[in-house]
């Protein structure tokens, strides 16, 4: 008894096609081994016609394929343009030779039933409608008009002009005449199914003077479109169902062994497996819509169907479109964490991959929202201003050429938890999904800025310090000035990191920023952060308000993206050799973007270097103080 299973008998008609599904036991070996379809000869030998290794015999060239569906433990042999010569005994099987596990299938291809010479052929897709034209002579104008469907013995009424309708056609069949033309009647049948296919006769009048016309209606199932996508990439199903279903609810479902399970529909249903990574977008009034799925997984491979019906569920006799999605595990898209965890008040730095060949593409970050059909409003982008509600706490750092850009979100709250997408205006396959989880903070943040309520006085000197733990001793520290176009890193240099010492004083690891003299444009958000090369780490944010000496606090306003930056170590002597041009905030440079700035850092303010007990968070003993430039207005 073979563990392979399939149809024992298959019968079809010349010119038609068959799709033979063979089922195999669920084992890893079976999923990966060769699948074949062979024809049995009189000698008992079985000659391969097609196999999953890519072999295709001459007689099947251009008219057959074999597709393995490992997720369903099936493989399918599709054969088109059948002829009577295809009648015979076959085997579908598994194994390196045709003597492996197999199942016997008998295929019988019959001649097309002879159609009367005046037969009119209508070819329609499943779910669509057909209008059959039935001409008649004037003398039969007052007589009964009818359409019947031929069965083996008789012709079964579909509809007639006395409003008699076969139960199978109620609500689907209409008999009508157009205008004043009394020589033709029409029958429209909607929501066509496979079962409507066949021979029909339309008739006007009775007896020998009756007008008759033969009609052959062919109802075709849509051929699945094959889609090949990489693991972790995205796929868009473009569904075009036609104007007649423009106002119906739309759905995308995935066929499993038993049914077609709805993944998403326009009535708000969504499969939890696709949470955070799916959108359905109505395109226009012509019944067109698309479904986008990001972060493709191995288990997403399979047979998908889109359709339209008021229930938002698959319904026979309604138009559909189908796809076979293959997910290639050898992906060009790097394997990144799909879940990022943060704590309230803290920050996250999310590395977004993009196609390295498209380094000049525009980069975006959006938040997936599941309400309605799902949407992903852009929160930040290389040429998109940060959304107002994210003021001061969201920035995108582009790192041209290395295939990654970074999005930093700080001042986290539990409401920030959810799904976010990385996307560009280039290669759409590189859309990726990140789930952000935010837990309640249980300890102090790693980076702390003092003073916390920062109000600078116009014209005076103002210093803020960013305290960091010893575990960050080897990382680059930076300050940047936030604007709704990004966070422009201010020229800075951490002198302490290059010094040899035997201790790391937890209390005195700091990088400071001095504004001297304070101007109105200095008001706004500033970030203190750490990074290692192109990898960004934690950040913290502070809003610096600027007020006049004689007045109370001024209104909090975001500042100009090109505000001049002045950064200094506390009480560091002024180095006025840096020109204003060099000190403009450069869009997204590294902390050491300007060689001149590194060279101009002196070895001053020795007294600020910390020395204390040995020991640090990461087992290194090192003292570091930060030296920075300070610029005069």
């Amino acid at each position: 008894k073979s563990p392979i299973f399939g149809p024992q008998e298959v019968s079809s008609i010349e010119g038609d096609s068959v799709s033979i599904t063979c089922y195999y036991p669920d084992t890893s070996v079976n999923r990966h081994t060769r699948k074949y379809w062979c024809r049995q000869g009189a000698s008992g030998m079985c000659t391969t016609l097609i196999s999953s290794n890519g072999y295709l015999s001459k007689e099947y060239s251009g008219r057959a394929n074999l597709i393995n569906f490992p997720e369903n433990n099936t493989f399918v042999i599709n054969i088109e343009q059948l002829t009577q010569d295809d009648t015979g005994s076959y085997k579908c099987g598994l194994g390196t030779s045709n003597r492996g596990l197999s199942f016997d299938v008998s295929l019988e291809v019959s001649q097309v039933p002879e159609l009367p010479s005046d037969t009119h052929v209508y070819t329609k897709d499943i779910g669509r409608n057909v209008t059959i034209e039935c001409p008649f002579k004037r003398e039969n104008a007052p007589s009964k008009k009818s359409l019947c469907k031929k069965t083996n013995q008789s012709c079964e009424l579909v509809i007639d002009s006395t409003e008699k309708v076969n139960p199978s056609y109620i609500g689907r069949a209409k008999l009508f005449m157009k205008g004043t033309d009394l020589t033709v009647f029409y029958v429209n049948i909607s929501h066509l199914t496979h079962n409507d296919a066949g021979l029909y006769i339309c008739q006007a009048g009775e007896g020998p003077s009756a007008d008759k016309k033969n009609v052959d209606l062919q109802v075709l199932a849509p051929e699945p479109e094959l889609l090949y996508k990489d693991l972790r990439s995205s796929v868009t199903f473009e569904c075009d169902l036609g104007r007649e279903v423009a106002n119906e609810a739309k759905y995308l479902c995935r066929m499993n062994k038993e049914t077609c399970d709805v993944i998403i529909n326009t009535l708000g249903k969504r499969d939890p497996d696709f949470e955070g990574r799916i959108l359905i977008t109505p395109k226009d009034d012509n019944g067109r819509f698309s479904v986008l799925i990001t972060g493709l997984r191995k288990e997403d491979a399979g047979h998908y169907q889109c359709g339209a019906h008021s229930s938002g569920l698959p319904q026979e006799g309604w138009p559909i479109q189908t796809w076979q999605l293959f997910v290639n595990e050898e992906s060009t898209i790097p394997n990144r964490r799909s879940v990022v965890k943060g704590v309230t008040g803290g920050s996250v730095a999310i590395a977004c991959p993009y196609n390295p060949k498209e380094s000049s593409s525009l980069k975006y970050w959006c938040r997936w929202e599941g309400d309605g059909n799902g949407h992903c409003p852009v929160l930040v982008g290389t040429q998109a201003q940060v959304q107002e509600e994210y003021e001061g706490r969201l920035a995108l750092f582009d790192q041209p050429g290395n295939g990654t850009y970074t999005v930093i979100l700080n001042q986290l709250t539990t409401e920030d938890a959810g799904f976010y997408w990385c996307l560009t205006n280039g290669d759409s396959r590189w859309r990726t999904t990140i789930e952000l989880q935010v837990a309640e903070a249980t300890r102090e943040p790693n980076l702390e800025v003092t003073p916390q309520n920062a109000t600078a006085v116009l014209g005076e000197t103002f210093t803020v310090s960013c305290h960091y733990p010893c575990k960050f001793y080897s990382q680059e520290k930076y300050w940047c000035k936030w604007s709704n176009k990004g966070c422009h890193i201010l020229p800075s240099h951490d002198e302490g990191a290059r010094q040899s010492s035997v201790s790391c004083d937890q209390s005195s690891q700091l990088v400071s920023m001095t504004l001297n003299p304070v101007s109105k444009e200095d008001e706004g958000w500033y970030w203190c952060g750490v990074k290692q090369g192109q990898t960004y780490g934690e950040t913290t944010a502070i809003y610096i308000a600027v007020e006049e000496r004689t007045r109370g606090s001024s209104h909090v306003n975001p500042t100009d993206a090109n505000a001049r930056a002045k950064v200094a170590l506390e009480e560091e002597v002024v180095d006025s050799s840096i020109s204003e041009k060099e000190n403009k905030a450069i869009p997204n440079p590294g902390p050491f973007a300007n060689e001149r700035e590194i060279q101009n850092v002196g070895d001053q303010a020795q007294e600020n270097r910390a020395s204390g007990d040995a020991g640090s968070a990461d087992g290194q003993s090192r003292s570091s103080s930060s030296k920075h430039h300070h610029h005069h207005h």
């Epitope: 038609d16 799709s19 496979h194 062994k257 049914t259 698959p314």
Partner: nanobody, 127 residues
Framework: EVQLVESGGGVVQAEDSLRLSCAAS????????MGWFRQAPGKEREFVAA??????????YYADSVKGRFTVSGDNAKKTLDLQMKDLKPEDTAVYYC??????????????????WGQGTQVTVSS
Amino acid sequence: EVQLVESGGGVVQAEDSLRLSCAASGLPFSSSRMGWFRQAPGKEREFVAAIGWSGRSTYKYYADSVKGRFTVSGDNAKKTLDLQMKDLKPEDTAVYYCAAHPDYYGDPRTSGAYRYWGQGTQVTVSS
């Protein structure tokens, strides 16, 4: 209301023949797959035979235990299903159920591949 009604069951001698029929009414579609299952006392429901229609092609499936003895046939448009049983054996004794599904996919041997079920008809084969 959807109804699948089986008929033709009865008591026969071993090696006799019997023909079961199933008529569907109230189905919102002409089925694309219909099948026969059976359940003997104290046993699981098991697949017997099925027929599937797609376009002008027909696909027939049989359980190993009935191959060569049972023949399934049906009319997709009329929503009828027949099972011609020959050379019956005592182990064929069971309640035979008719099942239908609007779609032509899913493993026909699994009961989950069918949406609608009949009440069953008893077949008893005495030795």
